[in-house]
Amino acid sequence: QGWQAFKNDATEIIPELGEYPEPPPELENNKTMNRAENGGRPPHHPFETKDVSEYSCRELHFTRYVTDGQCRSAKPVTELVCSGQCGPARLLPNAIGRGKWWRPSGPDFRCIPDRYRAQRVQLLCPGGAAPRARKVRLVASCKCKRLTRFHNQSELKDFGPEAARPQKGRKPRPRARGAKANQAELENAY
């Protein structure tokens, strides 16, 4: 469970461990937002190739405000979404290449969060209540993770202690502000 155990209401764009996010539509073809591919590091993959651009584990940056119940962060935070499959583009399924990519009895490589960072944010709440702070867990970098066809999804949950997502330590929040409300705010933040 790790960080999963802490409900991170304001980072609902970050998937549960074992899930793989797709960037919001606005980001998909927005090259200006894609400041770093593979985090500037050689991609983790099993294929021999001289053209790194053929590999599609991308780190897409976007900015959003953190919401927590009726409160909102004073400043926006910038975080990453890991996007794409991990393999040469020519080997990916046709079209967009978001489908599961299996080789017969071979491994599957997925683009998933590699490292996380926690950022403390000050929250502005109605009524001038006591100063409040919250820590949000943000993806710091992405990597390709091998998953053989014989492994289940839990094999992906190898993020180590940092994966423990203290999402719990937050203040109560009205049900009305669910994933969709936060998603809408996120989309308005670009």
Epitope: R120, G127, K171
Partner: antibody, heavy 118, light 107 residues
Framework: QVQLVQSGAEVKKPGASVKVSCKVS????????MHWVRQAPGKGLEWMGW????????EYASKFQGRVTMTEDTSTDTAYMELSSLRSEDTAVYYC???????????WGQGTLVTVSS | DIQMTQSPSSLSASVGDRVTITCRAS??????LAWYQQKPGKAPKLLIY???TLESGVPSRFSGSGSGTDFTLTISSLQPEDFATYYC?????????FGGGTKVEIK
């Protein structure tokens, strides 16, 4: 699995100090806030304060100001709460609790009974 | 300090009963209220936060409502494992304070 494991029970004399430890596992200590809450025998819960292990920031309840010190050893993911000038009314179970905000308590340690008696 | 007053302080109920516990704040706390369950010899467990948001893993028979000064915790159909003491806690103003607790006993 997020776990908080606290140190064992303590018996102290009035005027002495006690230091309770809270070892966390399953996540990185600096990614959360650490809270301390106490409960006198048969009584309710009382918030003592919180600390931010990442930067050493803290907020103590005014009732404990000057007597309580909350620290962390981030290399071992262990938090500490020291209470000085103990008196009999400090006899209580002391809990560490963690969360990603300063205002609610998501995971709790099992508690440490501190008995202050002459 | 904000005083949190729970009522009743104790109640007796049977399995299957609908149970309601109230918590009143001495001043408005918006919806910054959490509910905890504590069993004898154990640490409290978070049930609800932001007055009405169910903590992950908590059964849906638990629900919370209210805003401002008056809040309610409801257990729609009491189960054997629900016999415990329940505390409300305000997270709006320092120092954070708890209610005195409501002990739910078997009738």
């Amino acid at each position: 699995q997020v776990q908080l494991v606290q140190s064992g029970a303590e018996v102290k004399k009035p005027g002495a100090s006690v230091k309770v430890s809270c070892k966390v596992s399953g996540y990185t200590l600096t990614h959360t806030f650490m809270h301390w809450v106490r409960q006198a025998p048969g009584k309710g819960l009382e918030w003592m304060g919180w600390s931010d292990p990442e930067i050493g920031d803290h907020e103590y309840a005014s009732k404990f100001q000057g007597r309580v010190t909350m620290t962390e050893d981030t290399s071992t993911d262990t938090a500490y709460m020291e209470l000085s000038s103990l008196r009999s009314e400090d006899t209580a179970v002391y809990y560490c609790a963690t969360g990603d905000t300063t205002y609610k308590f998501d995971y709790w340690g099992q508690g440490t009974l501190v008995t202050v008696s002459s | 300090d904000i005083q949190m007053t729970q009522s009743p302080s104790s109640l007796s109920a049977s399995v299957g009963d609908r149970v309601t516990i109230t918590c009143r704040a001495s001043e408005g706390i918006h919806d910054a209220l959490a509910w905890y369950q504590q069993k004898p010899g154990k640490a409290p467990k978070l049930l609800i936060y932001w007055a009405s948001t169910l903590e992950s893993g908590v059964p849906s028979r638990f629900s919370g409502s209210g805003s401002g000064t008056d809040f309610t915790l409801t257990i729609s159909s009491l189960q054997p494992e629900d016999f415990a003491t329940y505390y409300c806690q305000q997270g709006d103003t320092l120092p954070y304070t708890f209610g005195g607790g409501t002990k739910v006993e078997i009738k």
